[in-house]
Amino acid sequence: QPDAINAPVTCCYNFTNRKISVQRLASYRRITSSKCPKEAVIFKTIVAKEICADPKQKWVQDSMDHLDKQIQTPKP
């Protein structure tokens, strides 16, 4: 789970060890702050949970790409 120590900086200290289906993902944001111990991606899921993930993992990169394409494709 993401953890905000001194708002507004949110950091991730652990990454999920389970792949999340893109069908369960709503959005994401990157964590690149130098105040955080590691770079991370925080996925917001369709059930409103936020999950920390490792941006080096392929499934994380693929999921971000998928979400980016969803944003770029206008809904009919």
Partner: antibody, heavy 119, light 108 residues
């Protein structure tokens, strides 16, 4: 340790309704969903529906749509399943089970509630 | 709805033998969001395997799951007396989260 404790056995008349409760302890209730699954005597498992309190989502199997209502009371960490217009074929053991809304496998189950529909 | 078909309906084996149970989906279960449960008479089901191949907490190593897409398998490498039960697969990629009809593993 997560525990789901269900209400006791019920005997109901055809056409009436039954409301089964499922009280959760040992976990963060609102962070998880509750599914309801039933099992008729000698038969397999049948998924009825689910509720995810955090997201406010409720899902029902088409077979039960309009007859089943699943609710949750976060203040008491209790989920409810109400089935109306009961018929003899609804005689079954009804289980509640916890799932993580991001995934969906049912990792903790209640002990089951036997509902008998008989005139 | 995704329909899951389990085979065989009944498997008659002796303790120590290997059990192979199959679960076939009517359409692809993406990201292998498939679970296996064990149920003994008079008891609630118990989660054995999730995400097709991950063992749930406390499940012995003799239970393993495999597969992707539409074909999934639960293997019990060497049957113990307590393993004789009914096994169900379930997909949870989409609602309704359907179950297979079950495979009964009985003592030969």
């Amino acid at each position: 340790q997560v525990e789901l404790v269900q209400s006791g056995a019920e005997v109901k008349k055809p056409g009436s309704s039954v409301k089964v409760s499922c009280k959760a302890s040992g976990g963060t209730f609102s962070s998880y969903g509750i599914s309801w699954v039933r099992q008729a005597p000698g038969q397999g498992l049948e998924w009825m529906g689910a509720i995810n309190p955090l997201a406010g989502h409720t899902h029902y199997a088409q077979k039960f749509q309009g007859r089943v209502t699943i609710t949750a009371d976060e203040s008491t960490s209790t989920a409810y399943m109400e089935l109306s217009s009961l018929r003899s074929e609804d005689t079954a053991v009804y289980y509640c089970a916890r799932y993580d809304g991001i995934y969906g496998e049912l990792d903790f189950w209640g002990q089951g509630t036997l509902v008998t529909v008989s005139s | 709805d995704i329909v899951l078909t389990q085979s065989p309906a009944t498997l008659s084996l002796s303790p120590g033998e290997r059990a192979t149970l199959s679960c076939r989906a009517s359409q692809s279960v993406s990201d292998a969001y498939l679970a296996w449960y064990q149920q003994k008479p008079g008891q609630a089901p118990r989660l054995l395997i999730y995400d097709a191949s991950s063992r749930a907490t406390g499940v012995p190593a003799r239970f393993s799951g495999s597969g992707s897409g539409t074909d999934f398998t639960l293997t019990i490498s060497s049957l113990e007396p307590e393993d004789f039960a009914v096994y169900y697969c379930q997909q949870y990629i989409s609602f309704p989260a359907t179950f297979g009809q079950g495979t009964k593993v009985e003592i030969k």
